[in-house]
Each structure stands twice: as structure tokens, then as C-alpha cells.
Amino acid sequence: ATKLTEEKYELKEGQTLDVKCDYTLEKFASSQKAWQIIRDGEMPKTLACTERPSKNSHPVQVGRIILEDYHDHGLLRVRMVNLQVEDSGLYQCVIYQPPKEPHMLFDRIRLVVTKGFSGTPGSNENSTQNVYKIPPTTTKALCPLYTSPRTVTQAPPKSTADVSTPDSEINLTNVTDIIRVPVFN
């Protein structure tokens, strides 16, 4: 069984979170994907999503978040640029598959953003000088309003969870508060 785990990223203000969520391409290549934040005691909120159906290697930008879905490679790339302290939180990638419930992809990301900037970025830390230029054709994708038929009685786990699943994606049943977000080019 695959455990529901999370990775802790410690970055400085102004840096870029640059991660990949891998999925079973045969099952989910063209499915709509989303990037969500899970705040303690709250339900996941969708911050950005790809188009439906998801387009191959086509950047979608929502504020400081850029999503790029590489169908051939079974990878969703997520970038959060110019990080702020208030961006700290638990994040996850999910796949929408209506009418089924969304699938969550491993691993969750626990982002901790601190003040100050380290002069020499680490191997995963892009500096503020890396301004991501997105083509003007960036899609204004709206995320679907998804309400789970089940009620959640507890907040998602904070650290490496004891939840075990037989597959690399799990059904996400605790999504009750998905927000629509504007897209900026």
C-alpha cells in the first residue's frame, strides 16, 4: 500500500516553489488537474486548475501560480513564484474526473516560507530574478465548483499520515469548498 505522505519545503520570501506531481498517464493524461491548499481545520481550496480537457504543455497562470501539464510524461508542473510568508501551508495536486470524486496525487507539499532571502539559492530554490514569462495565449481556465456528497468530520493530517491506499492516486472525499479564482496574464 502507498502511504499518504508529505514533503516539507522550506523557502524564503521571493523564491519559487517548483514541483512536479506525477500521475498515471494512461488514466489521467487529459483530465483536468488542480492545485489546492489545505488550511488547518478547513477543507481544500482550489487555487488554480488546468483546462478541461487539460491541454498538453500549455501553461495556465493564476496570479503567481503557473500550471503546466505534460501529457506524454504523466507530469503536472506547479510553480508558485515570488513566495510570500502567507503562502505557507499544506498543498496538494488533484485530478478532476466528474462524475467521480477527485483523485489526490502524492506527495502533499508542506510549504514553509520565511522572511529574508538567502543569497545563494539551493538546488530547488529559484531566486526572485527568475521571472517566469508566460505566453499571452495563457488560458483563463475556471475551476469547477465541486461539492463532495460526504461530510468531513476532521481536518486532514498535518504530517506523514497513517492513511494507506492501494494505488498511487486516492479518492479525495473532503472537498467541499472549491473557489473560483481570476486569471491574470
Epitope: 514541483v19 506525477d22 504523466g74 507530469l75 538546488s123 530547488n124 514569462k133
Partner: antibody
Framework: QVQLVQSGAEVKKPGASVKVSCKAS????????INWVRQATGQGLEWMGW????????GYVKKFQGRVTMTRNTSISTAYMELSSLRSEDTAVYYC?????????????????WGRGTLVTVSS | DTQMTQSPSSLSASEGDRVTITCQAS??????LNWYQEKPGKAPKLLIY???NLETGVPSRFSGSGSGTDYTFTISSLQPEDIATYYC?????????FGGGTKVEIK
């Protein structure tokens, strides 16, 4: 000793398939993605795709889709790359390479550990 | 796909010389670039990652710089053991692509 040990050289006829193995030792096999890169004689390096040994997820370069299959056996810490419908232009040295990442899910594609390579010759 | 144009394809320099190799991407790759050294009969070796970070254990005479589409790899003082072919590799976009390589020889 941290290393990737690949299977020996192969000679194949056009239309046949080849399966190259890559055994990891000295580190936790399931903690790092394995990539495959090839190099035809006198040519540059060409990425073929990646595999997550933990979950078995894979991604292939479009050029090889339908012909390549990347698998693994976690019990023996071994990754495999099978290429079918071989043609003469597939004659190359095939490398497995470990993708190093400070964080498992970070968008980092640095290959810090390579196998010695497996020469695959396709000839009638 | 992002094309990587590496130049020169070969060069010959004297021991102690400063050697510079360039790689130009067909689109902005945001510093997502690595440099490898390959010696005959051996697997490639990572030297520089994310455009300018020196891999652990690699001599400080090797360095990398650049941004956007243009990147440079430098050997500040060429040594006999540096005879090899050098490749750049981008990961700003998938598929990952490599430059054509630069063969470095000593005069």
C-alpha cells in the same frame, strides 16, 4: 557503494526487442526516479523517459512512445527498459540515470548517478 | 521541444587556458540547465546544476552562468584530466534535451 549496474551488451536483429536492466545498490531504490538516456555512436545524448520506482508511474518522450516500456522490480532494486521494433538507428549505448532531488517532488532533473551503459547493436 | 545549440562543437586549448562553452536555448529555460562531462568509455558526470551550482566534489575551476536563453560553461584553467566532451541539458520544459556536445582537447 552507491551505483547503478547495467546488463551486458546485446546484438539484435531489426524488428526484435531488447530489455536492458539497471540494478541499484547503496541507496534506497524507491526514493529516486530512474531515467533512461541513450547515445548513438558519435552522437549526443538523448533522453528517453523516466520512471518512479516507488509507484511505477512512467513518462516517455513522444519519439519512443509505443515502442518503449519502463518497468521495475522493487524487491531486487532493478529498473528495466524494453525497446521494441528495433531498427538500425536504435544502435546506441543505453544509460540508466538517477534523478537527484533535494525534495522528491521538486522539479529538478539532475542526473547525479549513471550506469556504465549498455551497448545495443541492431544489425541484420 | 526546446532545442539546445551548443558551441563550439570542438576546441583545442593549452594547459592553463581559460575555456568557454556556450549553450543557447530556443526559448527561455529560466536557469533550468545542467552541464555534464563525458570521457570516452565512461558515463556522463554532473558538474553544474541549475545553471551555476557546482556539484559536490567537482573542482572549483569549473563554473556556469547565464539566464534566459543564453548560458556559459567555463573552465578557468584547463587541466589534462579535463579532456572530455561536455554537454548542456535543459529541464525548463519537457522533453529534457541536451546540447550537441563540445569536445575539448589539449594542444
Amino acid at each position: 557503494q552507491v551505483q547503478l549496474v547495467q546488463s551486458g551488451a546485446e546484438v539484435k536483429k531489426p524488428g526484435a526487442s531488447v530489455k536492458v536492466s539497471c540494478k541499484a545498490s547503496g541507496y534506497t531504490f524507491t526514493s529516486y526516479d530512474i531515467n533512461w538516456v541513450r547515445q548513438a555512436t558519435g552522437q549526443g545524448l538523448e533522453w528517453m523517459g523516466w520512471m518512479n520506482p516507488n509507484r511505477g508511474n512512467t513518462g516517455y518522450v513522444k519519439k519512443f512512445q509505443g515502442r518503449v516500456t519502463m518497468t521495475r522490480n522493487t524487491s531486487i532494486s532493478t529498473a528495466y527498459m524494453e525497446l521494441s521494433s528495433l531498427r538500425s538507428e536504435d544502435t546506441a549505448v543505453y544509460y540508466c540515470a538517477r534523478r537527484r532531488a533535494v525534495y522528491r517532488s521538486s522539479w529538478e532533473w539532475y542526473f547525479d548517478l549513471w550506469g556504465r551503459g549498455t551497448l545495443v547493436t541492431v544489425s541484420s | 521541444d526546446t532545442q539546445m545549440t551548443q558551441s563550439p562543437s570542438s576546441l583545442s586549448a593549452s594547459e592553463g587556458d581559460r575555456v568557454t562553452i556556450t549553450c543557447q536555448a530556443s526559448q527561455d529555460i529560466f536557469n533550468d540547465l545542467n552541464w555534464y562531462q563525458e570521457k570516452p568509455g565512461k558515463a556522463p558526470k554532473l558538474l553544474i546544476y541549475h545553471a551555476s551550482n557546482l556539484e559536490t566534489g567537482v573542482p572549483s575551476r569549473f563554473s556556469g552562468s547565464g539566464s534566459g536563453t543564453d548560458y556559459t560553461f567555463t573552465i578557468s584553467s584547463l587541466q589534462p584530466e579535463d579532456i572530455a566532451t561536455y554537454y548542456c541539458q535543459q529541464y525548463g520544459n519537457l522533453p529534457l534535451t541536451f546540447g550537441g556536445g563540445t569536445k575539448v582537447e589539449i594542444k
